[in-house]
């Protein structure tokens, strides 16, 4: 179903963005890129 494909794709994109910020902070010490509290 196309909705499911879109949801999976967005979820994967969202995870990759979050992981990029995480890696920058924990393996790159780029603290300015930390995720702020909601």
């Amino acid at each position: 179903h196309s909705d499911g494909i879109f949801t999976d794709s967005y979820s994967r994109y969202r995870k990759q963005m979050a992981v990029k910020k995480y890696l920058a902070a924990v393996l790159g010490k780029r603290y300015k890129q930390r995720v702020k509290n909601k």
Partner: antibody
Framework: QSVEESGGRLVTPGTPLTLTCTVS????????MTWVRQAPGKGLEWIGF?????DAYYASWAKGRFTISKTSTTVDLKITSPTTEDTATYFC??????WGQGTLVTVSS | AAVLTQTPSPVSAAVGGTVTINCQSS???????LAWFQQKPGQPPKLLIY???KLESGVPSRFSGSGSGTQFTLTISDLQCDDAATYYC??????????FGGGTEVVVK
């Protein structure tokens, strides 16, 4: 600043188990918290992390097998349905530069 | 998912000597976010190097990291008895998070 894991024990396969990481002097609104495990005599295995906003992300092999959540001073790792392959020392780390001593989980029937 | 392969293991050298550990990734490490950890028996890992070549605060300058892309190296010069440990590389993988190498044991003669 310190990190300490607790909750590790002997459990039978399929019995859910929650490990707790208690932090002191660390603002969980400013750091990522990571869970890593190490089977006896083996290497390190990254499980996942939780961000400042409380969103958790997992290695693909760990998704569905583990759940990471947090309060203001603790970070929990729930092993949803342990198998013998989950026998390991579980480490919690602030970012990846401040680690606890780990807590041992043994899964056996 | 990236697979990190460490060579050689174990590696042995005399006090005052130099040890080189290689870490090869099956795919390019995201952002060159490659770290090196030291782990002694019964202890948690300790961060030595981050972003391939940057020395963590408090770590002796005898430890150095280099490399980019898929090939990385940890060099320990003026080897000390206290350096006897297992060393792990850990690389950034945007689909998986963090991938650890299998570890390299350093034996000091």
């Amino acid at each position: 600043q310190s990190v300490e894991e607790s909750g590790g024990r002997l459990v039978t396969p399929g019995t859910p188990l929650t490990l707790t990481c208690t932090v002191s002097g660390i603002d969980l609104n400013s750091y990522y918290m990571t869970w890593v495990r190490q089977a006896p005599g083996k290497g390190l295995e990254w499980i996942g992390f939780i961000d400042a906003g409380g969103d958790a992300y997992y290695a693909s092999w760990a998704k569905g097998r583990f759940t990471i959540s947090k309060t203001s001073t603790t970070v929990d790792l729930k092993i949803t349905s342990p198998t013998t392959e989950d026998t390991a020392t579980y480490f919690c780390a602030r970012d990846l530069d401040l680690w606890g001593q780990g807590t041992l989980v043994t899964v056996s029937s | 998912a990236a697979v990190l392969t460490q060579t050689p293991s174990p590696v042995s050298a005399a006090v005052g000597g130099t040890v080189t550990i290689n870490c090869q990734s099956s795919e390019s490490v995201y952002g060159n976010y490659l770290a090196w950890f030291q782990q002694k028996p019964g202890q948690p890992p300790k961060l030595l190097i981050y972003e391939a070549s940057k020395l963590e605060s408090g770590v002796p300058s005898r430890f150095s990291g280099s490399g980019s892309g898929t090939q990385f190296t940890l060099t320990i010069s003026d080897l000390q008895c206290d350096d006897a440990a297992t060393y792990y590389c850990a690389g950034g993988d945007i689909s998986e998070g963090v991938a650890f190498g299998g570890g390299t044991e350093v034996v000091v003669k």
